[in-house]
């Protein structure tokens, strides 16, 4: 399926909003760095069926939405930026859902992609656990924001690769 041109623009806007959410200098947070074990293999150019890639991307954005829509994120981050971020992510989800419908014929991700989706969910569980352990400190949010920017960028790269294969 062809993702609309607005989809890639939305991706860029979402990254810009993430960058703007910075509240403190990251230089004061170096010692809080953490290995969240990003599931890189789910974003590599393996024999990826397009429907599987779209399902993984959908899960990635859904989990990002969930992470940033908790009461703890609302307390730690700028609410106006968060609201704009939700709008962008919501649009991304709609675009990808339309694609899943075209590629697979159902909105639900097929069971054959369960492992990939589970890997993404576990990744976000590790992020949530880290935030909890760090008591949602400013530096913990800064580390998570940097991590989500990185994973979001990798998601964008996967979408670009999908587009170039069309």
């Amino acid at each position: 399926c062809d993702l609309p041109q607005t989809h890639s623009l939305g991706n860029r806007r979402a990254l810009i909003l993430l960058a703007q959410m910075r509240r403190i200098s990251p230089f004061s947070c170096l010692k809080d760095r953490h290995d969240f074990e990003f599931p890189q293999e789910e974003f590599d150019d393996k024999q990826f069926q397009k429907a599987q890639a779209i399902s993984v991307l959908h899960e990635m954005i859904q989990q990002t939405f969930n992470l940033f829509s908790t009461k703890d994120s609302s307390a730690a981050l700028d609410e106006t930026l968060l609201d704009e971020f939700y709008i962008e992510l919501d649009q991304q989800l709609n675009d990808l859902e339309s694609c899943v419908m075209q590629e697979v014929g159902v909105i639900e991700s097929p069971l054959m992609y369960e492992d990939s989706i589970l890997a993404v969910r576990k990744y976000f569980q590790r992020i949530t656990l880290y935030l909890t352990e760090k008591k949602y400190s400013s530096c913990a949010w800064e580390v998570v924001r940097a991590e989500i920017m990185r994973s979001f960028s990798l998601s964008i790269n996967l979408q670009k690769r999908l587009k170039s294969k069309e």
């Epitope: 960058a19 990251p26 230089f27 170096l30 760095r33 953490h34 940097a146 991590e147 920017m149 960028s153």
Partner: antibody, heavy 121, light 107 residues
Framework: EVQLVQSGAEVKKPGESLKISCKGS????????IGWVRQMPGKGLEWMGI????????AYSPSFQGQVTISADKSISTAYLQWSSLKASDTAMYYC??????????????WGQGTLVTVSS | DIQMTQSPSSLSASVGDRVTITCRAS??????LNWYQQKPGKAPKLLIY???SLQSGVPSRFSGSGSGTDFTLTISSLQPEDFATYYC?????????FGQGTKVEIK
């Protein structure tokens, strides 16, 4: 291919100003910090400071704070190191290197080729 | 500032030897330690990051271990191209600091 390309060697007199550059390519320049490292003749490596090119936030080693200025122009993927008044003791090789910021990834995984600065009257 | 102390400052070894370089931090730095190799007239090259992770493209004869304050770089079987100066560097907190270097020379 990731590359950091530094400006050429400089010969200056004490009291002169200087700005050397480090141009990044092959990666998203604003996604990594750029650090600067000094190596005086026959000596070891000394970290001078670092910049986040996305917003030009900087951090300096106390030894270099006020002695140099680090800046960046993200529109041309270039970081800079400058002196307003050079001293003979600034004679050294200066390296730039990229840093992953707060991400769990290799530190200083790519380095520039170095810029030799010679300050002599 | 976190002080990094390397030992020895220099060593002589032969091709095929097992070489060990140690690095001690003045306070606990977890696993936030990197090792670099530098040859004369060249920029440093990252070998090991986060104490024990081998950087892409680096031969497996290089390995790193340790956490907290004590770290080790091991070259299992020294090759002619390994004669160089090695530096440790802590990436736990600013200011970032390097060890003074260990020069590995031919015996």
């Amino acid at each position: 291919e990731v590359q950091l390309v530094q400006s050429g060697a400089e010969v200056k007199k004490p009291g002169e100003s200087l700005k050397i550059s480090c141009k990044g390519s092959g990666y998203s320049f604003t996604s990594y910090w750029i650090g600067w490292v000094r190596q005086m003749p026959g000596k070891g490596l000394e970290w001078m400071g670092i910049i986040d090119p996305s917003d030009s936030d900087t951090a300096y080693s106390p030894s270099f704070q006020g002695q140099v200025t680090i800046s960046a122009d993200k529109s041309i993927s270039t970081a800079y190191l400058q002196w307003s008044s050079l001293k003979a003791s600034d004679t050294a090789m200066y390296y730039c290197a990229r840093h992953p910021g707060l991400n769990w990834a290799p530190d200083f995984d790519y380095w520039g080729q170095g810029t030799l600065v010679t300050v002599s009257s | 500032d976190i002080q990094m102390t390397q030992s020895p400052s220099s060593l002589s070894a032969s091709v095929g030897d097992r070489v060990t370089i140690t690095c001690r931090a003045s306070q606990s730095i977890g696993k936030s330690l990197n090792w670099y190799q530098q040859k004369p007239g060249k920029a440093p090259k990252l070998l090991i990051y986060f104490a024990s992770s081998l950087q892409s493209g680096v031969p497996s004869r290089f390995s790193g271990s340790g956490s907290g304050t004590d770290f080790t770089l091991t070259i299992s079987s020294l090759q002619p191209e390994d004669f160089a100066t090695y530096y440790c560097q802590q990436s736990y907190d600013f200011p970032l600091t390097f060890g003074q270097g260990t020069k590995v020379e031919i015996k």
